[in-house]
Amino acid sequence: YHGCPSECTCSRASQVECTGARIVAVPTPLPWNAMSLQILNTHITELNESPFLNISALIALRIEKNELSRITPGAFRNLGSLRYLSLANNKLQVLPIGLFQGLDSLESLLLSSNQLLQIQPAHFSQCSNLKELQLHGNHLEYIPDGAFDHLVGLTKLNLGKNSLTHISPRVFQHLGNLQVLRLYENRLTDIPMGTFDGLVNLQELALQQNQIGLLSPGLFHNNHNLQRLYLSNNHISQLPPSVFMQLPQLNRLTLFGNSLKELSPGIFGPMPNLRELWLYDNHISSLPDNVFSNLRQLQVLILSRNQISFISPGAFNGLTELRELSLHTNALQDLDGNVFRMLANLQNISLQNNRLRQLPGNIFANVNGLMAIQLQNNQLENLPLGIFDHLGKLCELRLYDNPWRCDSDILPLRNWLLLNQPRLGTDTVPVCFSPANVRGQSLIIINVNVAVPSVHVPEVPSYPETPWYPDTPSYPDTTSVSSTTELTSPVEDYTDLTTIQVTDDRSVWGMTQAQSG
């Protein structure tokens, strides 16, 4: 194929790949008709003047995962057709001025995972056709004004995983075509008002894992096309009332891992497209009426690992499409009987790790599609008669680690568990806590003939009792709810996967569906 270097492989499709530790310089001679060249995992430490001079038809050049620390300014001379250039995962600390001069066709420039200490306006001033610029995983401490002023066609800019402590409000002002801006994992403490005003086409803004304490009220008011906003793992303690008011296209908002103490009614919205709202690991203590009422299409609401002790009966008004509600690991002692009444499409609810002492008989009365209820590790001694009767799709119920009182009043719950066991998975069985003569015994195998008569009047539900085990040939499909593998945080759907750390941390939100989380 027009002379392929021995250290490389060359395909008929004009693709050349050179890999291996024994390569210490750009191999020669490279086929003159090469359109794609990859130099990966070598010991090349520098690029000298014009090593690619004879392959002017090159469209894509990947020089990744090498020992590259020095590049001569004329290294990419004569590559006027080059559209894609990656220098990612090398050891570059400095970029020579003029390095990208003459790369008039360049659309994607990947400089991620190096050791770059600074960038200057002159670095990219010739790259007027650039659409994608990846600078994440470097050591940048600031971005000078004008650094991106010539990149008017830029649609994706990743500055994540650097050491940025502040951002100038003018640095992005000319990026009117930008769709994706990533600033995650820096040291930003605040974002000046107006920083994002020029980004009228922005669809994704990633600000997670910084140290942001305050959001300016109008910070996002010009970003009407924003679809994904990641604000998790910051120090945000309050949300200005109008901060999310102008985001009608938003479909993903993460606020977990902040210091939010309260949520005011109407703070979210209108956001007719928001499907998921992640608020776990904050300091929220109560939920007022109508706090989520603008989120008509919300399907996933994660409020776990807060300090919620009170939920107003109308807190979940408007959430008619909600499928998953996570309230686990809070301080709930009581729930109003109507609190879930509007959640007609709810499938999974996690209430474990609270202090619930009792549940109203009608708590799930209107939530007929529930498939999973998690109530383990509360202070429940019994449950009202008929509480699950109408839940024909229920196929996971967790009740263990509660102080069940196994007197005669427990019989309806015991019978329900026994008669419905094929629908309820094989989780840990509930165990009696009292009276003393049955402590430690499984609730479903206590000897009913020595069960102590109750000394109080059991609660009777106010809604009609209906059979919960309808006489059908088979139980509901227990595979309809997937495994309980849970993810630590929303996977923030990046093409550069360096930020994603998926774990199997069952403690985070305790749902039954593995969310892209």
């Epitope: 019989l411 026994l418 008669l419 840990t428 069985v429 479903i444 059979p467 919960w468 085990y469 006489d471």
Partner: antibody, heavy 113, light 111 residues
Framework: QVQLQQSGPELVKPGASVKMSCKAS????????IHWVKQMPGQGLEWISY??????KYNERFRGRATLTSDKSSSTAYMELNSLTSEDSAVYYC????????WGQGTTLTVSS | DIVMTQSPDSLAVSLGERATINCRAS??????????MNWYQQKPGQPPKLLIY???NQGSGVPDRFSGSGSGTDFTLTISSLQAEDVAVYYC?????????FGGGTKVEIK
């Protein structure tokens, strides 16, 4: 003490129906399941159905021919069998609780022309 | 349906000796870590009587000489010291899922 008192023996013709009863005493009727079990002469035991708070579950072999009902005010469970044949001649027991911990004395059904 | 197979069909044991009856289920009858296997005794002309529930728990008023063991698919009823009043037919039964099914029975006699 817990007791399940079943109705007396029945002699019926093929094609007819029969309704037998099981009256519970000595415990809270609504707190326990009532099962029905069939035993043909000299044979083993076969589960028919259960009823609990008006909810029922049937063995497919008896679906459509056995109907379980109960009267909470009299603490009595009933089983009706229809379209009877000689194969239905058997002793029918009611039993209490999920684990069948107490049994009635049985109702003998004879189907003969 | 879960099929329950008892063995032996009949068993003759001397008074005071141990009697062992086996029961095998066609699939596991375990749930929640509990085996939903029950044993009943039926004497001639009488209804069955619950001896053992959930594999190893004694029913009310059942003498200590009756014990149950096993998990999954294989279970055993043991009469540690056979008494004359133990002459009966013994049935195993699974209550893991509907239809609840019984074994064919084991007749225990005095040798």
């Amino acid at each position: 003490q817990v007791q399940l008192q079943q109705s007396g023996p029945e002699l019926v013709k093929p094609g007819a129906s029969v309704k037998m009863s099981c009256k519970a005493s000595g415990y809270t009727f609504t707190s326990f399941v009532i099962h029905w079990v069939k035993q043909m002469p000299g044979q083993g035991l076969e589960w028919i159905s259960y009823i609990y708070n008006d909810g029922t579950k049937y063995n497919e072999r008896f679906r459509g021919r056995a109907t379980l009902t109960s009267d909470k005010s009299s603490s009595t469970a009933y089983m009706e069998l229809n379209s009877l044949t000689s194969e239905d001649s058997a002793v029918y027991y009611c039993a209490r609780d999920y684990y069948f911990d107490y049994w009635g004395q049985g109702t003998t059904l004879t189907v003969s022309s | 349906d879960i099929v329950m197979t008892q063995s032996p069909d009949s068993l003759a044991v001397s008074l005071g000796e141990r009697a062992t009856i086996n029961c095998r289920a066609s699939e596991s009858v375990d749930y929640y870590g509990i085996s939903f296997m029950n044993w009943y005794q039926q004497k001639p002309g009488q209804p069955p009587k619950l001896l053992i529930y959930a594999a190893s728990n004694q029913g009310s008023g059942v003498p200590d000489r009756f014990s149950g063991s096993g998990s999954g698919t294989d279970f055993t009823l043991t009469i540690s010291s056979l008494q004359a009043e133990d002459v009966a037919v013994y049935y195993c039964q699974q209550s893991k899922e509907v239809p609840y099914t019984f074994g064919g029975g084991t007749k225990v006699e005095i040798k």
